[in-house]
């Protein structure tokens, strides 16, 4: 039987190609911050990674996916307190022995310079200045994202 993390990740991967006819998100909802073509919500509470994943799902969003170093830097610029860590949608896949985004793709090793070990039960957090490997079961804040897309947009299902 799959853990809640695996189930949520699998659900997201399986629905990657599904689209919806509802109008695209043209503006960020209240409390969400726009960063280029995304809306980001920085949590004010802390949670383990799996609960953070589930929380984003209930908001019809996903944990943050970072495309490249440029997007990482722009995201980090939105973090006001240098001591605070935020979960993103990247965790270590033991079976594939690699960092895996919740959309099923693997981390390009040049994108993020991760401090800490790549090992079982590890998830990725970001701070104002760095990227860290942490036990997924520790409690920190998290970042949800919604894509700003016209008319036909991909959905992240509730898990």
């Amino acid at each position: 039987q799959k853990s809640s993390i695996e189930k949520c990740s699998v659900d997201i991967q399986q629905s990657r190609n599904k689209t919806t006819e509802r109008p695209g998100l043209l503006n960020c909802p209240i409390y969400w911050q726009q960063l280029r073509e995304k809306c980001l919500l920085f949590s004010h509470t802390v949670n383990p990674w799996n609960n953070s994943l589930a929380d984003c799902s209930t908001k019809e969003s996903s944990l943050l996916l970072i495309r490249d170093k440029d997007e990482l830097i722009h995201t980090q610029n939105l973090i006001r307190d240098k001591a605070i860590l935020f979960w993103i949608g990247l965790n270590f896949s033991l079976s594939e022995k690699n960092w895996k985004w919740i959309n099923g793709s693997f981390l390009n090793s040049n994108d993020l310079e991760i401090r800490g070990d790549a090992k079982e039960n590890s998830c990725i957090s970001i701070s104002q200045t760095s990227v860290y490997s942490e036990y997924c079961s520790t409690e920190i804040r998290w970042i949800c994202q919604k894509e700003l897309t016209p008319v036909r947009n991909k959905v992240y299902p509730d898990s």
């Epitope: 039987q1 799959k2 853990s3 809640s4 993390i5 949590s43 004010h44 509470t45 802390v46 949670n47 383990p48 799996n50 609960n51 079982e120 039960n121 036990y135 997924c136 079961s137 520790t138 409690e139």
Partner: antibody, heavy 115, light 107 residues
Amino acid sequence: QVQLVQSGAEVKKPGASVKVSCKASGYTFTGYYMHWVRQAPGQGLEWMGWINPNSGGTNYAQKFQGRVTMTRDTSINTAYMELSRLRSDDTAVYYCARGAWGSNWGQGTLVTVSS
Amino acid sequence: DIQMTQSPSSLSASVGDRVTITCRASQGISNYLAWFQQKPGKAPKSLIYAASSLQSGVPSKFSGSGSGTDFTLTISSLQPEDFATYYCQQYNSYPYTFGQGTKLEIK
């Protein structure tokens, strides 16, 4: 230091409701989920649910759905757990606990349900 | 719901002994596991989170290990104040669930 101080013991009749309070100090109240756990006399621990003090969002264990209500008042850093339609088997010590793994606990509130 | 099974249910030991308590989950919980100590008439006290991380202020004689379904709590050298009931808890999925407890008594 972090402190969670709960309201005093209660004696209730079957069918009544009880509301237990948990006043937090020593940390940012809105920064951590507050969980509620109960323990019947001589028994183990049972998780009831949580409230997100920042948003007011809640998640209740299926067993308590429809009977439990968790609320908070951020102006006084206090979380509340109300249990309705009390039965004798709800007699227990009720605890509030900070965060997913209960890094800090209140001292407990004994709720006795007896006719 | 995930069932958490502790063994033994009770344990007699002497001051200075090294003791190990085990906790088994009915399905994999990664390392989303916490251990608590509870003394009669008192609230539980957090000892370990994330299966092996020591809670701030807890002495290093307490240690935790395990991942997936099997976990252990070890107390390296028992002191009189360590005689209590110990509980494990999973926080991998809702509802969070606890083991039934292990009562550690003085031999």
